[in-house]
Amino acid sequence: LSTGVSFFFLSFHISNLQFNSSLEDPSTDYYQELQRDISEMFLQIYKQGGFLGLSNIKFRPG
Amino acid sequence: SVVVQLTLAFREGTINVHDVETQFNQYKTEAASRYNLTISDVSVSDVPFPFSAQSGAG
């Protein structure tokens, strides 16, 4: 069964940021700013054709 | 530190798992200067199909 889409699970550490409870709440400014920066960053990295987007962003303590 | 986990979607056949990881790793320096994000411990794997229906791209 081919969907025409390939999915990749990616995980990484951001070592210069501290995890706090606001990263568990999508309504906080800290969560939304970090999510926006990460989304923008991935659009920059994979700007060649083929990149469809990202989803399921989760933040956890390192 | 903060661990970030996410799912990336690409048109099938346009990128392999090695290039997903390599292109991300090569951007780390720019991520530090542009977004002030110091990135390490990058791990990439393919997501077996089918997986959670809520994982639509976008």
Partner: antibody
Amino acid sequence: QVQLVQSGAEVKKPGASVKVSCKASGYTFTTYTMHWIKQAPGQGLEWIGYINPGSDYTHYNQKFKDKATLTRDKSASTAYMELYSLRSEDTAVYYCARQGNYAAYYFDYWGQGTLVTVSS
Amino acid sequence: DIQMTQSPSSLSASVGDRVTITCRASGNIHNFLVWYQQKPGKSPKLLVYNAKTLTDGVPSRFSGSGSGTQYSLTISSLQPEDVATYYCQNFWNVPFTFGSGTKLEIK
């Protein structure tokens, strides 16, 4: 037309080093990744690693990371592979091969091969 | 590392025969599978990429198929000029491993 022309055959003594060149023409050298492949006499193909001539990024098969170093000279449109601490099992034909451009996961052009013989 | 198991290692067939070579990957390589033909004393030549796309100039008697971990190269009607060794290659993840080769001969 695209051409990859490799340097000539080499005979080396055990413990020596050798540098094989691969001169590219007929395309923009910096926009295509260059790979290197080993083929021992009568044997199959073994991937050594690659260099991205534009960024100078290299990636090696772990098996060859202490055996080979990949470099390039952009001005000469030439890729190089240096092999160190040669042993008899390094005797092989070594090929350079160009990876196709964006989303092209194959080797579309190959050099003619360079035979490296290690013998005392 | 992904291991590529190619079979058979050698094959003898008659002109006009239908010939199939198979390649099994130790993990899902998502159709990032390439086939090359190598004639004695020559460099390998690209035949098929993305498991089933025939490269320009390759005769239509060659075809590739498969998905996941199982792939095959078929020659629908063997010709004398097809005598060669055929290799599959994983292009999904490093190291970009090759199969051990199938030596094809004419009976």
